[in-house]
């Protein structure tokens, strides 16, 4: 099919982060075409010679795929026709981090957009009361983080207080020798207060809250990826 050199189609990507060992998504959308057979999707990675993935004429074309991505990539084939060129990346590796290009060719024209993909490890923290300790103590644990994060404690009652003197944080390397288990202990905890354990690296920020009263303990945690922008 003919491609007008004057018309470039809009391609949009979103910076994202991958959790190593898990599956990730590299997001990319484009102006859709009416015929699937007229759409070509190429994913490239800066510094890599072969393609990350190619989809053309309605199916994967992997003859030029780089070895480091073999068997680990897929597009959402049924969504290509509506303009979704996102790439699923299986078993994310630390070395998958970098700059990617989503390159689209349709009968309307061509377009491309870059995205920064960060890789690391991040997990939800869980905060518990440590009943084995001699004083009232909280224990914050998160199983997988990389790179090494910072851990900060905060409390609702003592807002702005610095808990670094009454807390102790340790990092234990996991069996795969990359990610680490984060354990932070907060001492001298008072009752009827809400404490927050905040774990953060350049990829993600996670918070574990615990509300301790005489009658009950309430927990809540959430995780937010950083620097994810269009």
């Amino acid at each position: 099919f003919g491609i007008s050199g004057r018309h470039s189609i809009t391609v949009t990507t979103v910076a994202s982060a991958g959790n190593i060992g898990e599956d990730g998504i590299l997001s990319c959308t484009f102006e859709p075409d009416i015929k699937l057979s007229d759409i070509v999707i190429q994913w490239l990675k800066e510094g890599v010679l072969g393609l990350v993935h190619e989809f053309k004429e309605g199916k994967d074309e992997l003859s030029e795929q780089d070895e480091m991505f073999r068997g680990r990539t897929a597009v959402f084939a049924d969504q290509v026709i509506v303009g979704n060129a996102s790439l699923r990346l299986k078993n994310v590796q630390l070395t998958d981090a970098g700059t990617y290009k989503c390159y689209i060719i349709t009968s309307k024209g061509k377009g491309n957009a870059n995205l920064e993909y960060k890789t690391g490890a991040f997990s939800m923290p869980e905060v518990n009361v440590d009943y084995n300790a001699s004083s009232e103590t909280l224990r914050c644990e998160a199983p997988r983080w990389f790179p090494q994060p910072t851990v900060v404690w905060a409390s609702q009652v003592d807002q702005g207080a610095n808990f670094s003197e009454v807390s102790n944080t340790s990092f234990e390397l996991n069996s795969e020798n990359v990610t680490m288990k984060v354990v932070s202990v907060l001492y001298n905890v008072t009752i009827n207060n809400t404490y927050s354990c905040m774990i953060e690296n350049d990829i993600a920020k996670a918070t574990g809250d615990i509300k301790v009263t005489e009658s009950e303990i309430k927990r809540r945690s959430h995780l937010q990826l950083l620097n994810s922008k269009a």
Epitope: G5, E46, K110, N112
Partner: antibody, heavy 117, light 105 residues
Framework: EVQLVESGGGVVQPGRSLRLSCAAS????????MNWVRQAPGKGLEWVSA????????YYADSVKGRFTISRDNSKNTLYLQMNSLRAEDTAVYYC??????????WGQGTTVTVSS | SYELTQPPSVSVAPGKTARITCGGN??????VHWYQQKPGQAPVLVVY???DRPSGIPERFSGSNSGNTATLTISRVEAGDEADYYC????????FGTGTKLTVL
């Protein structure tokens, strides 16, 4: 400032070997794939070889396959081209160039290789 | 293997527009890059991805790519534009065009 500086060129007899170097500065060398491109006297540009940022992947032009080896030392920010079994037709200015997606965005000034008996 | 064909020479008067073509089978499906090379100097990228310009390259340089032909257009040609121009695509390696000598009359 991004810079590429080639060295190692010279006059060599047919059948002999030569190793070219390209010192890179001003960017994170290991993040970028690199190329060698040559230009015979009075002729056009001819791509020779490419190497991935990590050094694990390499491509060669048919004209040099089996004779030339591209490599890199990311700790030294240096690209190499080992040229064996040199022929008269390998006489050229050799440029190293940084790969940018499907093209090349930065070139060195070139080093001259003359294969002559 | 993939081949790119350029006219050996193009002549243009100062202030006029020069067009240098690059022919290749279904080249419109590929990303085309253009390099300028002055005598005794290394090539310089002037247009990438068919029509984008690197920083520092004048707006007078533009590109298009359709069907079987990509075109480098230099408007308001100056004496300093006299050089060899090469188109290039990637096809499991860098493929260069045969080169075009631009002469400013």
């Amino acid at each position: 400032e991004v810079q590429l500086v080639e060295s190692g060129g010279g006059v060599v007899q047919p059948g002999r070997s030569l190793r070219l170097s390209c010192a890179a500065s001003g960017f994170t060398f290991g993040d970028r794939a690199m190329n060698w491109v040559r230009q015979a006297p009075g002729k056009g540009l001819e791509w020779v070889s490419a190497i991935s940022g990590s050094g694990s992947g390499t491509y060669y032009a048919d004209s040099v396959k089996g004779r030339f080896t591209i490599s890199r030392d990311n700790s030294k920010n240096t690209l190499y081209l080992q040229m064996n079994s040199l022929r008269a037709e390998d006489t050229a200015v050799y440029y190293c160039a940084r790969k940018r997606w499907y093209g090349m965005d930065v070139w060195g000034q070139g080093t001259t290789v003359t294969v002559s008996s | 293997s993939y081949e790119l064909t350029q006219p050996p020479s193009v002549s243009v008067a100062p202030g006029k527009t020069a067009r240098i073509t690059c022919g290749g089978n279904n080249i419109g499906m590929k990303s085309v890059h253009w390099y300028q090379q002055k005598p005794g100097q290394a090539p310089v990228l002037v247009v990438y991805d068919d029509s984008d310009r690197p920083s520092g390259i004048p707006e007078r340089f533009s590109g298009s790519n359709s069907g079987n032909t990509a075109t480098l257009t230099i408007s308001r040609v100056e004496a300093g534009d006299e050089a060899d121009y090469y188109c290039q695509v990637w096809d499991r390696g860098m493929i260069f065009g045969t080169g075009t000598k631009l002469t400013v009359l």
